[in-house]
Each structure stands twice: as C-alpha cells, then as structure tokens.
Amino acid sequence: PEPPTACREKQYLINSQCCSLCQPGQKLVSDCTEFTETECLPCGESEFLDTWNRETHCHQHKYCDPNLGLRVQQKGTSETDTICTCEEGWHCTSEACESCVLHRSCSPGFGVKQIATGVSDTICEPCPVGFFSNVSSAFEKCHPWTSCETKDLVVQQAGTNKTDVVCGPQDRLRA
C-alpha cells in the first residue's frame, strides 16, 4: 500500500506505518507494527527524556560539578533535566550554567546598583555627587555624604565619590 504522507501529533512514520511516540520519561524499545503497539520503557535513574519521542537512549542528567562552583538547584526527574546554579558568591557564566565565576565587587567610587544572583553578575554604578563609597564591595550601595548641618557642624573637608565629607565645629563669632 502507498504509505501515509503524514501522521498525527504524537506519532511518527516508520516502514509506511504511523506509530505512537513514547511519552516523556520513556524511551523507544521497538517500533509498532500494524497490529502491535510501540514498545517504550521508562528512563533509568539519573536519565531523562523531556518530549514525546522515538529515542532509543535517554539523556543523562546534567552533573552540577562542585569543582566548578556548581550545586543542584532542582533535581532532575525522568522527564526533566537537573538544573544547576552557583554556590553563594558566584554566578553562572552562561545561560546553560556550565561553570561559575566569583561575583564582581564594585570599586571605591562605585556602589552596587543590583546585587548579583546565581545567574547574573553584580551591576555597579558610579556614586553621584552627594554620595560616596570607600570600599570594594559586592553588596554596598553608595552612601550619602554626612549632613554636617543637621549636627550643627560645618563642612571642613568636601566629600568626593570615594570619601565622606569631614565635619567640624563652627567658628565662634568674635565679640
């Protein structure tokens, strides 16, 4: 007989016959025939298949290598891969998160605009006028200069983006 030109969703064409695909979490053992079903088997421990498929081998779960700074964020199942993330203080170098790098610190004169996550690095911003940062940090924002006036003091030394203002006592008015 002439073969069908297309099979339905969740089916595949083999030997002029439409066969059911194996469901996620299972691999193909043998193709169907006209009067037998597709034979599928569940994936083994540490294996997965995440789509309707005709794969004869399941994929291995991703290994979150601690030597690369990785740890398991979500354990894999027979239908999903393991999701890795980075240890505290590190972030992934790519979307696939195959390795990690240390979070960047913001140098003096710069503050943290956005704290790093497991997948994104620290974002720094220069301290604007009126703010300073005198440390290299992955957490500290720019701090506002001290307000001498509220302490009944006067500015003795102007602040910079790296240093706070220095306050001092007001000069006594001479009689």
Partner: nanobody
Framework: QVQLVESGGGLVQAGDSLRLSCTAS????????MAWFRQAPGKERDFVAA????????HYADSVKGRFTTTRDNAKNTMYLQMSSLKYDDTAVYYC?????????????????WGQGTQVTVSS
C-alpha cells in the same frame, strides 16, 4: 481523510447469515487498517474483527471466531463482514473503523475514523 458508511444490516433469524459492507470515500483506503466493532443495547462497544491494509492479516474476537470472516477489496474501497450461524447475542449496532497508527486490534481509541453504524437484529 476517509468517511465510512456501513450497510447490509437487518433483521434475521438465529442460524442465518448476513454480509455487512463498509464503504470508504476519500483517498488512500489501502493505507488504513480497518476493523469492525459492535455495541449491544445498554453495553459498551466491543471489538469484532480487524484486517490489515493489504488484507492478508485478520484478527477476531473469541466470540465470533469460526463464524465471522472479514475481507476487503481495496479497488472498491470496501471492507466486508460475512456473518454466519448468527446468534441472538450478535444483536447490536455494527460499526466500521479505520486507523493509520499501529496498535493492538482491539484498542478502540487507536481508530481515528468511524462510521455511523448499521443495526443487526437476530431473533430467536
């Protein structure tokens, strides 16, 4: 796509014979595995017989083995069910069905196309 129409049903006496036909309209009849199912009043639809695309392989329910024979004529886009030694228990609406997916013959859900059915009544 195929559309299926059954014919040949009717009222017969126990022990009589009857031949049902299932005619398909549409293309590529010879790419479909065909089957007969039946549904008695108040019961579920049951598998009766199936035939391979080229007509060389047939399967039958135990209840009809040796009494019913299914054949097909791909040139005429038609499948037949020859029923003999009919019994009162054979009374049902008989449906023909077609599928392209490989499956065990009895699996009703594998059949993609169904006819409207033809009534067979066997009086005792």
């Amino acid at each position: 796509q195929v559309q299926l129409v059954e014919s040949g049903g009717g009222l017969v006496q126990a022990g009589d014979s009857l031949r049902l036909s299932c005619t398909a309209s549409g293309r590529a009849f010879n790419t479909y595995t065909m089957a007969w199912f039946r549904q008695a009043p108040g019961k579920e639809r049951d598998f009766v017989a199936a035939i391979s695309r080229d007509g060389t392989i047939t399967h039958y329910a135990d209840s009809v083995k040796g009494r019913f024979t299914t054949t097909r004529d791909n040139a005429k886009n038609t499948m037949y069910l020859q029923m003999s030694s009919l019994k009162y228990d054979d009374t049902a609406v008989y449906y023909c069905a077609a599928r392209r997916v490989g499956a065990v013959p009895e699996r009703e859900s594998a059949y993609e196309h169904w006819g409207q059915g033809t009534q067979v009544t066997v009086s005792s």
